[in-house]
């Protein structure tokens, strides 16, 4: 149920996005053989971070995480295991 | 009452941390004048981030930024604006 | 495979209208200033990218969902 | 200033048990992938560190608590 | 760290191609970046382009589309560079590099470059 | 494309001296910064990349640092296998390009 290992390429790319650092986006674009439009599209909503800031990019970090860490990313099992893991782990 | 405007210097280390990009966390660390030991002492702990995976870095993001945008942190104040906003912002 | 909800919210931000990905970015996170920054993003690359760079886009997602590192 | 609910989870991260971190962590996000990466993280960095690292480190803290950029 | 070996020194006459080999060992291939470098005697680098050996994705410098073609053979670790329409201006050493890092943004790793020299 | 622009293009000094190379970009390119040696007829190595973080095996004394679009190598008490080409390269937007180079030469 780990979110990344649902699909690590994603994050990859997303966080190269996020990052602003073209060259960055290329590595990890070249993984999926991107071509050179896909490459200028991608660069486009990179553009949209760099110029909006750190806090941009930190906040829709925020939101990803927590699309990818929520129910319905991590199905109902997940949250059901909660309490357990509470009183199991924590030694309560 | 954003987030990372109450102290963005830690903001700005934390994320540097967790994403595991060296080149980031000295960045950061030289704004506060860190020392070699402690330039040390924080890259062993990013260390621990990119060992357990890009997972771990977002769970752990994931972590960081709720603390900082629960109630403990934010206030009552933001927390009543929400349903405000839904109405609004989004055009209900 | 990626999340459904994961493919939903990028698809809205690349085809849906600002207050689509907007309400959508609201289900799962909604303090304002969060919102305020899906809005901002959302009209930044509504505004640079035309419906071909769209495509393209849409284009490399399925590249990444279709990659065996997905 | 910083928040003071994350400077007690930086403050266990570091001087903590794993149980009081853990502990700490699940007030706030308490799903077992996130609980247990918590835990994951608390006992690489007890293993890596040694207790002038964790001084070095609480001290790159109080420059960053008290920092102008703060 | 490990080894990053270039085949031998090649002259070739103008108009032909070239395949240049860089034979790897000691680390996984797999999941590296391999460049490949131009350097003419007693100037700077110029970078041509990379792969990413365990999708054969590439990236090039714009300036050698076309020119230049890299590939992989991931059962013997071993990352290619043809290079077509030789002039003279291709004379030249390329280098082979492992990417390294966290991000993997360096040319840490280099072979120990091939002479290509073009001549009628 | 982003411009390498170095400085001085060759410069003497003996062993026990301190030098300093400097490199300065076409544009911003935010620490991503890498310096390599290369000895004669030998292939590069990576000396220092993120600006200032040193290689593995590179001796203390040599120190990388800047920011923005100026950076600087200093080499403090040269040693003899010092001496060659040293150059900078930048890993912000393709191509990544290097400076066309510095030669250091024993006076």
């Known amino acids: 149920v780990k979110m990344a290992e649902t699909c690590p390429i994603f994050y990859d790319v997303f966080f190269a996005v996020a990052n602003g650092n073209e060259l960055l986006l290329d590595l990890s674009l070249t993984k999926v053989n991107a071509t050179e439009p896909e490459r200028t599209a991608m660069k486009k909503i990179q553009d949209c971070y760099v110029e909006n800031g750190l806090i941009s990019r930190v906040l829709d970090g925020l939101v990803m995480t927590t699309i990818s860490s929520s129910k319905d990313c991590m199905g109902e099992a997940v949250q059901n295991t909660v309490e357990d893991l509470k009183l199991n782990t924590l030694g309560r | 009452v954003k987030m990372a405007e109450t102290c963005p210097i830690f903001y700005d280390v934390f994320f540097a941390v967790a994403n595991g990009n060296e080149l980031l966390l000295d960045l950061s660390l030289t704004k506060v004048n860190a020392t070699e030991p402690e330039r040390t002492a924080m890259k062993k702990i990013q260390d621990c981030y990119v060992e357990n995976g890009l997972i771990s870095r977002v769970l752990d993001g994931l972590v960081m930024t709720t603390i900082s945008s629960s109630k403990d942190c934010m206030g009552e104040a933001v927390q009543n604006t929400v349903e405000d906003l839904k109405l609004n912002t989004l055009g209900r | 495979e990626i999340c459904p909800a994961v493919k939903r919210d990028v698809d809205l931000f690349l085809t849906g209208t600002p207050d689509e990905y907007v309400e959508q970015v609201a289900q799962y996170k909604a303090l304002p200033v969060v919102l305020e920054n899906a809005r901002i993003l959302k009209n930044c690359v509504d505004a640079k990218m035309t419906e071909e760079d769209k495509e393209n886009a849409l284009s490399v997602l399925d590249k990444i969902y279709t990659s065996p590192l997905c | 200033e910083i928040c003071p609910a994350v400077k007690r989870d930086v403050d266990l991260f570091l001087t903590g048990t794993p149980d009081e971190y853990v502990e700490q962590v699940a007030q706030y996000k308490a799903l077992p992938v996130v609980l247990e990466n918590a835990r994951i993280l608390k006992n690489c960095v007890d293993a890596k560190m040694t207790e002038e690292d964790k001084e070095n480190a609480l001290s790159v803290l109080d420059k960053i608590y008290t920092s102008p950029l703060c | 760290q490990g080894q990053m070996q270039q085949s031998g020194a090649e002259l070739v006459k103008p108009g032909a191609s070239v395949k240049l080999s860089c034979k790897t060992s000691?680390?996984?291939?797999?999941?590296?970046?391999i460049s490949w470098l131009k350097q003419k005697p007693g100037q700077s680098l110029e970078w041509i382009a990379w792969i990413y050996a365990g999708t054969g994705g590439t990236t090039y410098n714009q300036r050698f589309t076309g020119k230049a073609q890299l590939t992989v053979d991931s059962s013997s670790s071993t990352a290619y560079m043809h290079f077509s329409s030789l002039t003279t201006d291709d004379s030249a050493i390329y280098y082979c590099?492992?990417?390294?890092?966290?991000?993997?943004?360096?040319?840490?790793?280099w072979g120990q470059g091939t002479l290509v020299t073009v001549s009628a | 494309d982003i411009q390498m622009t170095q400085s001085p293009a060759s410069l003497s000094a003996s062993v026990g001296e301190t030098v300093t190379i400097t490199c300065r970009a076409s544009g911003n390119i935010h620490n991503y910064l890498a310096w390599f040696q290369q000895r004669q007829g030998k292939s590069p190595q990576l000396l220092v990349y993120n600006a200032e973080t040193l290689a593995d095996g590179v001796p203390s004394r040599f120190s990388g640092s800047g920011s923005g679009t100026q950076y600087s190598l200093k080499i403090s008490s040269l040693q003899p296998e010092d001496f060659g080409s040293y150059f900078c390269?930048?890993?912000?937007?393709?191509?990544?390009?290097f400076g066309g180079g510095t030669k250091l030469e024993i006076k």
């Open positions: 390269q930048h890993f912000w937007s393709r191509p990544p390009t």
């Open positions: 590099a492992r990417h390294y890092g966290n991000p993997p943004a360096w040319f840490a790793y």
């Open positions: 000691g680390f996984t291939f797999s999941s590296s970046y």
